[in-house]
């Protein structure tokens, strides 16, 4: 049902859903801080633009009585319950920030007349693609898929002279929310990734993964998995690995690879890590000081969600346009705004674009080094290290199928 929005007469409110079930096990206080810091910045920016308006956030907390798992498994109805709470209290803001779980976002989008914009830090799954009033500020699965297909097809780089068309995907069901949906997208038989590959098998057991590492009859040399180095070590340990195996470790929201004095453990030598380029100043900013390397991106997405709202509010107010219209709700896409740590670009469907970075372990320095970057906005790969000190033969990535000659 239509809920009146607290969104006029110079007073603009943001509804922030503080859900017990969240894409990351982050304490709410870090998200509260992010939202409040964002508000301070937005107020300053509006003031500087000569707009004398009030911007506030209302935090809507789940009662946690039913949806108490703390992760995304029981989130489907939690978002709807919070929307009902908002509806009953007649306290809807101009924009809704949260939820982060794919299940809850999908359900909320499905079951509500969304005449207001919805900004999510998460909602990684393909089921949240192409939603007209949904903006996602953390890389969704679709962006990962496009990188992988692009990289698989690449065959004209000094370190990658073969196109690949095969892959194993390790997915054991214990993944974090982001990994769950990333791997889900790779597994889906109708997805772009599956469509472009000739062979793809999902490994669901630890033993299956471990056996492939030295199996002479394997159908692919490439294994995609998702998680941090520790996750890989638990699985792989110090087992021997065939020399032409390439493990692609998807670990997008983890800045630790870029921190000073980080040395790559020996078990990472056969691994290419796919992560996001860290913000210019985020590693040392006051905002991120209390956040672990894997959680900065989540809190930052909340902060940037506030800044995005401020950006759109400023544009609409300067143009004398109404905020409570479908035009406003549909405007949170195909734009670049000033985020906390530099420009943030949203694509035509409101999904954040970013620079993905593929890292390798230098056999000389035992450091993580950038092999290439990928701009999700233009779907283009840019080589960085033209002569990497790989563990692989001739410092080139092997073919994806053992014994197959040049393509």
């Amino acid at each position: 049902s239509q809920v009146s929005q607290n969104c006029h007469n110079g007073s603009y409110e943001i509804s922030v859903l503080m859900m017990g079930n969240s894409a990351f096990a982050e304490p709410l206080k870090n998200l509260e801080d992010a939202v409040n810091e964002g508000l301070e910045i937005v107020r300053g920016r509006l003031q500087n633009a000569g707009l004398n308006v009030t911007v506030n956030a209302t935090f809507m907390y789940s009662d946690g009585l039913i949806h108490n798992s703390g992760d995304c498994r029981s989130s489907t109805c939690e978002g709807l319950d919070l929307l009902r709470k908002i509806s009953n209290a007649q306290r809807m803001g101009c924009v809704l920030i949260g939820p982060s779980c794919t299940y809850s976002t999908f359900q909320m989008y499905l079951d509500t007349e969304l005449s207001y914009p919805m900004i999510s830090a998460g909602s990684f799954g393909l089921s949240c693609d192409y939603k007209e009033t949904l903006t996602r500020l953390m890389s969704p699965a679709r962006k990962l898929m496009y990188f992988l297909v692009n990289f698989w097809k690449t065959n004209d780089l000094p370190f990658k002279t073969y196109s690949w068309s095969t892959s194993y995907v390790y997915k054991n069901g214990t993944e974090t929310e982001d990994c769950f949906w990333y791997l889900n997208a790779l597994e889906a038989s109708v997805s772009y990734f599956s469509h472009e590959l000739g062979f793809k098998v999902v490994l669901r057991q630890d033993k299956e993964f471990q056996d492939i590492l030295m199996d002479h009859n394997r159908k692919s040399n490439v294994i995609i998995m998702c998680g941090g180095p520790e996750f890989l070590y638990k699985l792989k340990g110090d087992r021997a690995v065939a020399e032409d195996i390439v493990i692609i470790l998807v670990d997008l929201f983890n800045d630790q690879y870029f921190e000073d004095n980080v040395t790559a453990p020996d078990y990472m030598k056969n691994v290419l890590v796919l992560t996001l380029s860290p913000g210019n100043s985020l590693l040392n900013s006051s905002f991120s000081r209390n956040l672990s390397p894997t959680k900065r991106d989540f809190a930052l997405a909340y902060l940037n969600g506030i800044l995005l709202f401020g950006h759109m509010l400023k544009i609409f107010l300067e143009n004398g346009e109404n905020i409570t219209t479908p035009k406003f709700a549909h405007a949170f896409r195909n734009l670049t705004f000033e985020g906390y740590d530099g420009p943030v670009t949203l694509d035509d469907w409101g999904d954040v674009d970013s620079t993905m970075v593929l890292l390798y372990t230098s056999v000389d320095t035992k450091k993580y080094k950038v092999l290439l970057t990928y701009d999700t906005h233009v779907n283009k790969t840019y080589p960085v290290d033209m002569s990497p000190t790989f563990t692989w033969k001739n410092s080139k990535l092997p073919n994806d199928i053992t014994g197959r000659g040049p393509q």
Epitope: A25, P27, E32, D33, Y61, G70, S286, R289
Partner: antibody, heavy 116, light 110 residues
Framework: SVKESGGGLFKPTDTLTLTCTVS????????MNWVRQTPGKGLEWIAI???????YYASWAKSRSTITRNTSENTVTLKMTSLTAADTATYFC????????????WGPGTLVTISS | AYDMTQTPASVEVAVGGTVTIKCQAS??????LAWYQQKPGQSPKPLIY???TLASGVSSRFRGSGSGTQFTLTISGVECADAATYYC????????????FGGGTEVVVK
């Protein structure tokens, strides 16, 4: 270290100003809290100021408390208005560890007595 | 509100015995829970954070467990020096709070 000051005897309706002076660490990298303990009772959280000056208050304290900080003087201040006898307590200043896990450093406390 | 309920309010234990203190959160706080020990006339001393990690210099006789809404502090091989009041505290949210600390459990050592 952390040390509270400003306690003593106050009258009902007075305004209380407590100061927490810190040394050995920077206020810009820690959240700082005020906690109180009424005689023979438990701990009661009052307010927090984050490393970037965002403030939060317990619901009961919100309308009459203000927490501020001065990074150049290394002080955190709690101002509480409209005092009543129920505000008689030992007031502690406590630092939250850098990851936000727990209050790792507490002051010895300062006793505040409200009596007419 | 994220309310913390501690039980029992008071417990007697013999030297060498084991004591168990429970803390319940009104909503899931994952493992964002800390335990403190406070002796009369002193400020609280941190014992455990993230539900189960021992704070620096704390004896391994203290053990924390639990996640979500149910947490436990166990003191084994109780010594006279353990006589104190113990408090749990959620460190999950700063907003929407009445307190954040549990009501406390007094441990009396016989």
């Amino acid at each position: 270290s952390v040390k509270e000051s400003g306690g003593g005897l106050f009258k009902p309706t007075d305004t209380l100003t407590l100061t927490c002076t810190v040394s050995g660490f920077s206020l810009s990298s820690h959240r700082m809290n005020w906690v109180r303990q009424t005689p023979g009772k438990g701990l009661e959280w009052i307010a927090i100021i984050t490393h970037n000056s965002i403030t939060y208050y317990a619901s009961w304290a919100k309308s009459r408390s203000t927490i501020t900080r001065n990074t150049s003087e290394n002080t955190v201040t709690l101002k509480m208005t409209s005092l009543t006898a129920a505000d008689t307590a030992t007031y502690f200043c406590a630092r939250e560890d850098s990851m936000g896990y727990y209050f790792d450093l507490w002051g010895p406390g300062t006793l505040v007595t409200i009596s007419s | 509100a994220y309310d913390m309920t501690q039980t029992p309010a008071s417990v007697e234990v013999a030297v060498g015995g084991t004591v168990t203190i429970k803390c319940q959160a009104s909503q899931s706080i994952s493992n964002w829970l800390a335990w403190y020990q406070q002796k009369p006339g002193q400020s609280p001393k941190p014992l455990i954070y993230r539900a189960s990690t021992l704070a620096s210099g704390v004896s391994s006789r203290f053990r924390g467990s639990g996640s979500g809404t149910q947490f436990t502090l166990t003191i084994s091989g109780v010594e006279c020096a353990d006589a104190a009041t113990y408090y749990c505290q959620q460190t999950y949210t700063n907003n929407h709070l009445d307190n954040g600390f549990g009501g406390g459990t007094e441990v009396v050592v016989k």
